[in-house]
């Protein structure tokens, strides 16, 4: 079948990185500069993508593959092949389908990427909250009440009403 196909269509013999040049008796010609063909048998080469402005080159164009872009620092890619750049979220936010959203109460994100994670539950380790959590920071767990200096109350006071910045016990 391949032999029959190549007899019928000489262009099928042209490998990636070349095109079947109708102007030169269907000879396989190399793709011109700044163009590529990623598959064999193509009658034209595609123009290489140029990574400009907020887009920067992640991978240079070659005769057989297109250039690949990513975004300049402070931005990240959106879409197939990085067609758009979106500003990184701030600490205390996470990226959702609708963009950057503040972390919900009881969660935090200390990075500009990734998702909001639940505050550490200090009581699971028998510890108490030393520093309250925020949208940007996890709670800091302190020693358990029993570890406190002699004479200190070993009774944990009742948890206050839930307010922003307080870890649920």
């Amino acid at each position: 079948f391949e032999r029959t196909r190549s007899l019928q269509d000489p262009c099928s013999n042209c490998p990636a990185g070349t095109f079947c040049d109708n102007n030169r008796n269907q000879i396989c010609s190399p793709c011109p500069p700044n163009s590529f063909s990623s598959a064999g048998g193509q009658r034209t080469c595609d123009i290489c993508r140029q990574c400009k402005g907020v887009f920067r080159t992640r991978k240079e164009c070659s005769s057989t593959s297109n250039a690949e872009c990513d975004c300049t620092p402070g931005f990240h890619c959106l879409g197939a092949g990085c067609s758009m750049c979106e500003q990184d979220c701030k600490q205390g936010q996470e990226l959702t389908k609708k963009g950057c959203k503040d972390c919900c109460f009881g969660t935090f994100n200390d990075q500009k990427r990734g998702i909001c994670r639940p505050w550490t539950n200090c009581s699971l380790d028998g510890k108490s909250v030393l520093v309250n959590g925020t949208k940007e920071r996890d709670v800091v767990c302190g020693p358990s009440p029993a570890d406190l200096s002699p004479g200190a109350s070993s009774v944990t006071p009742p948890a206050p009403a839930r307010e922003p910045g307080h870890s649920p016990q």
Partner: antibody, heavy 116, light 107 residues
Framework: QVQLVQSGAEVKKPGASVKVSCKAS????????MHWVRQAPGQGLEWMGA????????DYNQKFKDRVTMTRDTSISTAYMELSRLRSDDTAVYYC?????????WGQGTLVTVSS | DIQMTQSPSSLSASVGDRVTITCRAS??????LNWYQQKPGGAVKLLIY???RLHSGVPSRFSGSGSGTDYTLTISSLQPEDFATYFC?????????FGGGTKVEIR
């Protein structure tokens, strides 16, 4: 904050040229392509082209290719769009816009009136 | 060039109404679709990018959806400040092209 401030309204005669400026502030000018879009009275938005301030490289809409020139002066964070051989149907508001694959910030627009 | 067909070209609605505007591309634009609002004074603002992502500061009553060639902008409960003209725009290929616009007027 990020801002694009354009030059003032212009009145030109047919056959003349107009040069509209767009001054950027609040961000690194060279880091983002600047696009130009126009809107004729009562009409929709029409993309004219773009310039990469870092290199000066341009992409033009074929419709304007032989009449438009986009330039920039990085020292004053300003992009320019010059349209030559003006006709009455070039009467429009011309906008510059910063590009991230979408136009997140637009200039206030510059009205260019072409009239004899 | 990729043609963008927006409908309706105009609509009348009341405050509190749910409004839907559609945009159809002449070929698959792989979600590279943005929506803009233009107030009568001429100022243009980005509302939604990459089909559904809300630009910072845009109220959550605005939402976008779609894929392939068909896209939608929805205003869940129209407010007085939403009376304006809305444009879709594709970023899949140069030249960037816009829909013809939808003017949202007070009924």
């Amino acid at each position: 904050q990020v801002q694009l401030v354009q030059s003032g309204a212009e009145v030109k005669k047919p056959g003349a040229s107009v040069k509209v400026s767009c001054k950027a502030s609040g961000y690194t000018f060279a880091g983002f392509e600047m696009h130009w879009v126009r809107q004729a009275p009562g009409q929709g938005l029409e993309w004219m082209g773009a310039i990469d301030p870092k290199t000066g490289g341009t992409d033009y809409n074929q419709k304007f290719k032989d009449r438009v020139t986009m330039t920039r002066d990085t020292s004053i964070s300003t992009a320019y769009m010059e349209l030559s051989r003006l006709r009455s149907d070039d009467t429009a508001v011309y906008y510059c816009a910063r590009d991230l694959g979408y136009f997140d910030v637009w200039g206030q627009g510059t009205l260019v009136t072409v009239s004899s | 060039d990729i043609q963008m067909t927006q409908s309706p070209s105009s609509l009348s609605a009341s405050v509190g109404d749910r409004v839907t505007i559609t945009c159809r591309a002449s070929q698959d634009i792989r979600s590279n679709l943005n929506w803009y609002q233009q107030k009568p004074g001429g100022a243009v603002k980005l509302l939604i990018y990459y089909t559904s992502r809300l630009h910072s500061g845009v109220p959550s009553r605005f939402s976008g959806s779609g894929s392939g060639t068909d896209y939608t902008l929805t205003i869940s409960s129209l407010q007085p400040e939403d009376f304006a003209t809305y444009f879709c725009q594709q970023s899949e290929k140069l030249p960037r092209t816009f829909g013809g616009g939808t003017k949202v007027e007070i009924r």
